[in-house]
Interface confidence: low
Amino acid sequence: QLSLPSILPNENEKVVQLNSSFSLRCFGESEVSWQYPMSEEESSDVEIRNEENNSGLFVTVLEVSSASAAHTGLYTCYYNHTQTEENELEGRHIYIYVPDPDVAFVPLGMTDYLVIVEDDDSAIIPCRTTDPETPVTLHNSEGVVPASYDSRQGFNGTFTVGPYICEATVKGKKFQTIPFNVYALKATSELDLEMEALKTVYKSGETIVVTCAVFNNEVVDLQWTYPGEVKGKGITMLEEIKVPSIKLVYTLTVPEATVKDSGDYECAARQATREVKEMKKVTISVHEKGFIEIKPTFSQLEAVNLHEVKHFVVEVRAYPPPRISWLKNNLTLIENLTEITTDVEKIQEIRYRSKLKLIRAKEEDSGHYTIVAQNEDAVKSYTFELLTQVPSSILDLVDDHHGSTGGQTVRCTAEGTPLPDIEWMICKDIKKCNNETSWTILANNVSNIITEIHSRDRSTVEGRVTFAKVEETIAVRCLAKNLLGAENRELKLVAPTLRSELTVA
């Protein structure tokens, strides 16, 4: 379980000066995002960016270049993977106020002025001030309405139907909102019908179960339409529930399903006393046997830069539910030994998403990765090759004498991904080699000098330069480069005559 993200400044609320800039930093153990008061169209001066830091935490910064009244509101930092549409956002919050002497209330959208109340429930009239110190009163046609006020939310209370106005005074100037319309929703005479299918995907031999429920109505006629209806395959049942309210539950069961039972299952309810009809349907698919489909969102050859964070996402469709595992070079991935994590989440009934996450790519992370999904009827896998892109570096620079002939070969071994290019330079005046202008590129077509290049493997290359005769001490430089970087190394070649003199000495 991840601990909640943290926000800097570490405050519940903050008052920001009009037209000034402000920034909020969020730190989390996984990728974090911001939710903020303005809509996409309005947020041109809100910038969100990720920031590197050495703590190992993910950092996302929200920056506002020029604060306005519309920036007043709740800013929430949350983990990306925890956001679901139906749940309230779980995360860390900070409330920002941007007081504006000309804008007492935070601007709202038109729909915010429609306040729906169900029966005698409490409701919120969402007039929020840009300054927490501004006093506000609520009025309706009869005068001031007593209700509790919170500048972050508005007025909270039990309101009768009708228009309400919020009023505030800022520096002697009076502000009023346009009217908020409170209206109630009562239980209607319309049919309230709900359909439920715990599963919509089956395989041959399984039992299909679909239910339809009618609420707050006792006089209902319900009909089923489904593929096996003609053969009378289905068994229907009715259960009446009276507490806490009236509910009629109709269940259709189709035992020993076959592929031919695939299709639309529809329930149509008619109120016996009125010409009111409601229908719901669900599509059921029955497969001959279980299946697995793997759909990667990346190619079979992927690259990652050294120390980069990278995610590989694979969509899996499967029934029955699959077991999903990851292999590296055909061996099970042991997550606690590496900075590689995997996870699986269920997206829909038969849809799953598996993620392979590289936290900080290393050279040894290169290799063949395989996702394997299996259930009792099928096994599918997908393999991709990962290359960690590494700046070029020289592993070795050595020379090799050809005995009495006086010839010498210099070998330069370099590694990097993409494979580096190797280039040779020489300096003939050994005393001046500290000066860059004394070095010249070694041309391919010079007589008595042969250059060649060989790939040793995917990331290692060996360049050789052979001098037919070395008559005086020279310096040789190997330059290895790829688009991520370059490195050079130098070596002194001593003429054999000089070497023998040194040996004698």
Epitope: S299, L301, E302, A303, P418, D421, I441, N444, N445, L483
Partner: antibody, heavy 117, light 107 residues
């Protein structure tokens, strides 16, 4: 066989933004060994490198155009795109997309973009 | 930026003749110099990479040489289909640059 195909409007008004897309077929834009670039050629003139992108999103731009150029990549569509803002008549050219690793080895057939009101 | 200067700007030659185009760089660029051929209304095609390596499918009559700052493209025994503009290009130092081009016409 790798193929690159440029697409986008052939006529752009001065001060507007020129937008072109290059669609790669016969190979993956996500190949780790290659970069993807844009080059242009004004009528009757020579070639000018505009910029380059790697499939991870890393970009390299010609300093003479840097303030106006944005190159982006969409690996899911196997495409990369060029945006050149605040265009003038001097930006009238045939725009080519190409693949390279130091060398531009595969080119699109080019698309003529005219800047005129 | 590195400036590449080609010479000559224009050549008019007869078939079977030998053609030499030179490219001079404003500073040392090693061997990361490449040659392209562009025919009218076509996109450029790679001929020679890294100063002297022929690109696959390029006729053997095209060859390249040089390193450092001076490079040469040689067309041995010119054919009618070789009428085109030839460009050199360096990829050693950003921004990558091209020569101004040499137009070869067949008499």
């Amino acid at each position: 066989q790798l193929q690159l195909q440029e697409s986008g409007p052939g006529l752009v008004k001065p001060s507007e933004t020129l937008s072109l897309t290059c669609t790669v077929s016969g190979g993956s834009i996500s190949s780790s060994n290659y970069y993807w670039g844009w080059i242009r050629q004004p009528p009757g003139k020579g070639l000018e490198w505009i910029g380059t992108i790697y499939y991870t999103g890393s970009t390299y731009y010609n300093p003479s155009l840097k303030s106006r150029v944005t190159i982006s990549v969409d690996t899911s569509k196997n495409q990369f795109s060029l945006k050149l803002s605040s265009v003038t008549a001097a930006d009238t050219a045939v725009y080519y997309c190409a693949r390279h690793h130091w060398v531009f080895d595969y080119w699109g057939q080019g698309t003529l973009v005219t800047v005129s009101s | 930026e590195i400036v590449l200067t080609q010479s000559p700007d224009f050549l008019s030659v007869t078939p079977k003749e030998k053609v030499t185009i030179t490219c001079r760089a404003s500073q040392i660029i090693g061997s990361s110099l490449h040659w392209y051929q562009q025919k009218p209304d076509q996109s450029p095609k790679l001929l020679i990479k890294y100063a002297s390596q022929s690109f696959s499918g390029v006729p053997s009559r095209f060859s390249g040489s040089g390193s450092g700052t001076d490079f040469t493209l040689t067309l041995n025994s010119l054919e009618a289909e070789d009428a085109a503009t030839y460009y050199c290009h360096q990829s050693t130092i950003l921004p990558w640059t091209f020569g101004q081009g040499t137009k070869v016409e067949i008499k």
